[in-house]
């Protein structure tokens, strides 16, 4: 994923507060296609721009996502800005028609490690965090960060709690998760190591 | 280049076992999900097994469990089929297949028959 | 248990852009469930196009694309070629278990 995804961040980026703010409050009322989920109220009002991004594009992909962030920019009256991105995203002959997801390009960060750099994802896409919590107990989770992840009501809410423990893990923890991660959820992860 | 070359069919009469394996090569084989498919006389294509990258977490159809077992060795970059009480209906081609990004074998055939 | 429907047969001509769809019994098909879709041609020659909703392996034709359109699945063949006459296959991840179509034959004349 690398064109479509690139350009929502742009764009994003260039909202002030105040316009983010807004964009999130039409996002949860603009029309969606069929098939397609909202983003959980909870979740969207708290994500900074690069959260938001990776949300957008594990929600609906990258080329329904640009088009999607494209709809409410111009909602909002950013009709340049809108313009700006749907240009960007259709680029040279690397854009796919309408309603296609075009092939995957990698846009890896050098700097990040593949837990932050998927955050958004994985708060939203991953099941199975009891199995991972018993993997992570004693290396890389104390008993009260056990305990505290364990008691969240939802899989979303758990990840959220288990990601406000990470910014204090050196990669080699990092790495801990990532190994539990691709052995609990193998296709998750390599889905998002595409990304 | 991803290759995933199966052996061990044959044939077996009902109530029998085979063990089949599938050698892979061109990617990282200890980090993926693998799993076993089978296309019946019929030409449909049934999931037989999946195991995930580290081994522990592994899963059937109704149909083949407790029958069959998946399993993998990543030190010889190899995944296996053990199959046991084997039926009629469980005459197949068998293909092994990484299908979280749409990788195939050529398939080993199995039959079972009196 | 989930169903996973396809279109029984379609026909296209050479040059064409066709679409074959993959339907769950279960709801919308979601990234989650890693879409897969698979070419069967004569002799159980069976060739992976797409893994994981939209991503195409090295050496698949550019002309092979997955999505998600709608509530579906979908395999798009944008110009059609003779040799893509064959019967496509697509599977959906169930979080516990893979369930396969019945599979569409695709005629190209």
């Known amino acids: 994923m690398g064109r479509a995804r690139d350009a929502i961040l742009d764009a994003l980026e260039n909202l002030t507060a105040e316009e983010l703010k807004k964009f999130k409050l039409k996002l949860l009322s603009v029309p969606l296609r069929e098939g397609y989920g909202r983003i959980p109220r909870g979740a969207l009002l708290s994500m900074d721009a690069l959260d938001l991004t990776d949300k957008l594009v594990s929600f609906y992909l990258e080329t329904y996502g640009a088009e999607l962030t494209a709809n409410v920019l111009r909602d909002m009256g950013l009709q340049e800005m809108a313009g700006q991105l749907q240009a960007a995203t259709h680029q040279g002959s690397g854009a796919a028609p309408a309603g296609i997801q075009a092939p995957p390009q990698s846009a890896a960060k050098p700097g990040l490690h593949f837990i932050d750099q998927h955050r958004a994802a994985l708060i939203a896409r991953v099941t199975n965090v009891e199995w991972l919590l018993d993997a992570l107990y004693g290396k890389v989770l104390t008993d009260e960060q056990y305990q505290a992840v364990r008691a969240e009501p939802t899989n979303p809410s758990k990840m959220r709690k288990l990601f406000s423990f990470t910014p204090a893990w050196n990669w080699t923890c990092k790495d801990l998760l990532l190994q539990a991660l691709r052995e609990s959820q193998s296709y998750l992860v390599e889905d998002l190591e595409r990304s | 280049e991803v290759q995933l070359v199966e052996s061990g069919g044959g044939f077996v009469k009902p109530g029998g076992s085979l063990k089949l394996s599938c050698a892979a090569s061109?990617?990282?084989?200890?980090?993926?999900?693998m799993s076993w498919v089978r296309q019946t006389p019929e030409k449909r294509l049934e999931w037989v097994a999946t195991?995930?990258?580290?081994?522990?977490?592994?899963y059937y159809p109704d149909s083949v469990k407790g029958r069959f077992t998946i399993s993998r060795d990543s030190a010889k970059n190899t995944l296996y089929l053990q199959m046991t009480s084997l039926r009629s209906e469980d005459t197949a081609i068998y293909y092994c297949?990484?299908?979280?990004?749409?990788?195939w074998g050529q398939g080993t055939l199995v039959t079972v028959s009196a | 248990q989930a169903v996973v429907t396809q279109e029984s047969a379609l026909t296209t001509s050479p040059g064409e852009t066709v679409t074959l769809t993959c339907r769950s019994s279960?709801?919308?098909?979601?990234?989650?469930?890693?879409a897969n879709w698979v070419q069967e041609k004569p002799d159980h020659f069976f060739t992976g196009l797409i893994g994981g909703t939209d991503n195409r392996p090295p050496g698949v034709p550019a002309r092979f694309s997955g999505s998600l359109i709608g509530d579906k699945a979908a395999l798009t063949i944008t110009g059609a070629q003779t040799e893509d006459e064959a019967i496509y296959f697509c599977?959906?991840?169930?979080?516990?278990?893979?369930?396969f179509g019945g599979g569409t034959k695709l005629t190209v004349l």
């Open positions: 195991i995930y990258s580290g081994g522990i977490f592994t």
């Open positions: 599977a959906l991840w169930y979080n516990n278990h893979w369930v």
């Open positions: 279960t709801g919308a098909v979601t990234t989650n469930n890693y």
């Open positions: 297949a990484r299908l979280g990004g749409s990788y």
């Open positions: 061109g990617f990282t084989f200890s980090n993926y999900a």
